[in-house]
């Protein structure tokens, strides 16, 4: 049917509470296309009736809830004038009790349900709702190990859980509750997230200098390989940590089973005021999921991104 | 529709207090953070500190820790901002704010204002 | 406390003409979650402020697509494609990262 197959990581998700999915590929789903949802290869569209459990909402896929029977392979097809894409998209769902201590560790959720906080400072977290413009999100809630979360180092703000002084006891399991409402109805969403703590290495009193990257996008085509380098300069008896980042987690934990984003090893050139550190982020075969994303260079204090972009189409 | 509506213009003598109200309708009072913003004269906007409705949970900036107090009465949807010790760098005008949504920030809603004088 | 740096002070500008401020914060805006807690607001003569931007790029409700807002982390820009008389008033950047919220100290700008 001439449509060129791209497939998306897999989506692990929770049943009984809802769920949508946006079909976005950057950069035709920003001019004149058409978006089709379609379940295991059906020929039938998903229905765009709003009062159905499943169904599309713009370009939006929409589960009011989602079931244990939804898993599968959802394919959206984006039209254009004179292109044709097929996204397919695997979702498995599980059953999940986030309170019963008795059922086993959770499958491999994604990590926006792996969050990190750094020790000492002030931080947060942040409950991702990724929702299309019909659903309404209430008033959302936070816990800890169950139990509704209050006092003072704590304020919800937005979709945000500001943690300030963050201790040690401040990791575990953590869940974000809000209330969606859509079409008059009420549904709750849950979402569960682990929060570890890391201590950032001491600044040495130095601030370091980011040379390169410089907060700024790149442009790459899908399917390639790229490496990117931090370069950084600093103090020659600094003891700051140079690392990359993705969702503010280190990028060899958050590829940890694909492997297919790298941090390099740190090299150094000493000159005789500082040192110039790089490390590199490699990407073995840069994917959809990867553009617009920020990946940030970490130097003690000192952070800067880059964004990978699709190359504007050549009407040549 | 939302709605912020603020208590009238006061004038303090320095060493007072004010107390300004902020009457919400159109929406559910206790899902949302009410803010207060002052202005002084001519000068930019300032950040005072939050109240949340739902539980009297109070976020200050710092500057205003030890003269701030915030306060609601659920049954009108009104939240009260009370400045003590008064000077004459607290003449400014008061603004209470909403956010867009409870999920997005910036402040969409605002009240009318109300004009603080401190004056001897 | 973060920092919001505005320039320039004052703009004069035709109307139908483009015009541009800029804002600069001491800290970078842009979360992990990839969300820039950055917003520009405009205060007319008179008014209360009303938001223009929300999170460095997304338009608010009812503002005209003339306005247009960009930037990096720490870097922003509000664009006007062509100014209208409508448009005058102090334009205000503002974070809202962490507490407490910052305000910068506002560009005023008028009609030539």
């Known amino acids: 049917d001439g449509c060129k197959d791209i497939f998306m990581k897999n989506e692990i998700l929770s049943a009984s509470q809802p769920f949508a999915f946006n079909c976005t590929f950057p950069p035709i789903t920003s001019g004149e296309v058409s978006v089709t949802w379609y379940k295991n290869s059906s020929k039938i569209p998903v229905s765009k009736i709003i009062q159905s459990r499943i169904h599309q909402d713009e370009t939006w896929i929409l589960f009011l809830p989602m079931e244990w029977g939804d898993s599968g392979v959802y394919q959206c097809v984006i039209k254009g004038r004179d292109s044709c894409h097929r996204i397919h998209v695997n979702l498995t769902v599980f059953e999940k009790h986030w309170c019963d201590t008795s059922i086993g560790g959770l499958p491999n959720l994604s990590d926006e349900y792996k969050q990190i906080l750094h020790l000492g400072k002030d931080d947060s977290l942040t409950c991702h709702l990724h929702f299309p413009k019909s659903c309404v999100l209430g008033p959302i809630k936070w816990y800890k190990d169950c139990n509704e979360i209050k006092g003072e180092r704590f304020t919800v703000l937005e979709t945000r859980l500001l943690v300030s002084n963050v201790s040690a006891e401040d990791r575990g399991n953590y869940a974000c509750q809000a209330i969606l409402t859509h079409s008059g109805k009420q549904y709750e969403v849950l979402n569960g997230i682990t929060v570890s703590i890391t201590e950032r290495a001491g600044y040495g009193g130095s601030v370091p200098k980011i040379i390169y990257p410089k907060n700024h996008s790149i442009e790459v085509q899908l399917g390639t390989t790229l490496i990117v380098d931090c370069n950084v300069t600093d103090t020659k008896d600094n003891t700051n940590l140079r690392c990359w980042r993705v969702n503010n987690t280190l990028v060899d934990d958050y590829y940890d089973e694909s492997k297919r984003i790298r941090e390099g090893v740190e090299t150094h050139v000493s000159f005789r005021e500082h040192n110039l550190y790089t490390v590199n982020i490699t990407f073995l075969e840069v994917k959809m999921e990867d553009y617009g994303l920020p990946f940030m260079c970490h130097a003690g204090v000192s952070t800067a991104y880059i964004i990978l972009q699709l190359p504007a189409p050549d009407f040549r | 529709q939302v709605q912020l509506v603020q208590s009238g213009a006061e004038v303090k003598k320095p060493g007072a207090s004010v107390k300004v109200s902020c009457k919400a309708s159109?929406?559910?009072?206790?899902?949302?953070?009410m803010y207060w913003v002052r202005q002084a004269p001519r000068q930019g906007l300032e950040w005072m500190g939050m109240f949340h409705p739902s539980n009297a949970v109070t976020r200050l900036n710092q500057k205003f820790k030890d003269r701030v107090t915030m306060t609601r009465d659920t049954s009108t949807s009104t939240v009260y901002m009370e400045l003590s010790s008064l000077r004459s760098e607290d003449t400014a005008v008061y603004y209470c704010?909403?956010?867009?949504?409870?999920?997005?920030?910036?402040?969409?809603?605002w009240g009318q204002g109300t004009l603080v004088t401190v004056s001897s | 406390d973060i920092v919001m740096t505005q320039t320039p002070l004052s703009l004069s500008v035709t109307p139908g003409q483009p015009a541009s401020i800029s804002c600069r914060s001491s800290?970078?805006?842009?979360?992990?979650?990839?969300?820039?807690?950055f917003y520009w607001y405009l205060q007319k003569p008179g008014q209360p402020p009303q938001l223009l931007i929300y999170q460095m790029s997304n338009l608010a409700s009812g503002v005209p697509d003339r306005f247009s807002g960009s930037g990096s982390g720490t870097d922003f820009t509000l664009k006007i494609s062509r100014v209208e008389a409508e448009d005058v008033g102090v334009y205000y950047c503002?974070?809202?990262?962490?507490?407490?919220?910052?305000f910068g100290g506002g560009t005023k700008v008028e009609i030539k």
């Open positions: 704010a909403r956010t867009t949504s409870m999920i997005i920030g910036g402040f969409a809603y």
């Open positions: 503002a974070q809202n990262l962490e507490l407490p919220l910052t």
């Open positions: 159109g929406y559910t009072f206790t899902n949302y953070w």
């Open positions: 800290k970078s805006l842009l979360h992990s979650n990839a969300i820039t807690y």
